[in-house]
Amino acid sequence: FERTRSLQDPCSNCPAGTFCDNNRNQICSPCPPNSFSSAGGQRTCDICRQCKGVFRTRKECSSTSNAECDCTPGFHCLGAGCSMCEQDCKQGQELTKKGCKDCCFGTFNDQKRGICRPWTNCSLDGKSVLVNGTKERDVVCGPSPADLSPGASSVTPPAPAREPGHSPQ
């Protein structure tokens, strides 16, 4: 099938980085500046992505691959292929419509992005608070109060702090 296709369609011989130029008897012409074709047999080249303003160039466009952007410092990428840049905040803050705002009491954010999440409720696991939470850190749960009673034979080591899941962006 491939052989018959290439006999019928001269465009299928055009490699990546070129396009099949209908204006020139379907010969393979190189992609013009600031354009690319990542696969063979293309009838047009795609315009290169421009990384400007809030975006900066991570990888230059070539005749066979699109440019790749990331975000300027102080911002982070969102979406496939860094389709958006979103402002960073400090740990202990979350991004709102009014910019970065401190986490409310009882919540924390240990990253520069995402939302403030509630502290772990140690008592739900029958544990006590070993280290209080802050805006930047979750509480650390320790042994249950029963484990700390004088009759207890040994003290169980404190449980590690819960690894918070990433909030959906």
Epitope: M84, C85, Q87
Partner: nanobody, 123 residues
């Protein structure tokens, strides 16, 4: 092609005023939040203000609140930033950027921005 083109920058005295404009094309302007960000010399990019689709919600970074006003004209696909009582620390390149629509992964994110217009505030 989606395009944003800023204009209106220039040299102004401390305490003076400027009005920046941003002409949008290639997309349905009225469906998107719009944002102004700025980059001062030797500093990172800073969010300045944003405005929702119909102009009923406007938000500002604390340092410009009460001095700058963001507005939009959906009929003419234009975004504006009126800057009053300008200070030396407002010197920067100002970029207009497209924010999210109702279906975006983030209302706060930006997916297109212009080339910027330079504002210099001097004594």
């Amino acid at each position: 092609e989606v395009q944003l083109v800023e204009s209106g920058g220039g040299l102004v005295q401390i305490g003076g005023s400027l009005r920046l404009s941003c002409a949008a094309s290639g997309f349905t302007f009225s469906k998107y939040w719009m944002i102004w960000v700025r980059q001062a010399p030797e500093k990172g990019l800073e969010w300045v203000a944003n405005i929702n689709q119909d102009g009923s919600e406007k938000y500002y970074v604390d340092s410009v609140e009460g001095r700058f006003t963001i507005s939009r004209d959906n009929a003419n696909n234009s975004l504006f930033l009126q800057m009053n009582s300008l200070r030396a620390e407002d010197t920067a390149v100002y970029y207009c950027a497209r924010g999210g629509d109702d279906y975006s992964i983030s209302h706060f994110g930006m997916d297109v921005s212009g080339q910027g217009t330079r504002v210099t505030v001097s004594s």
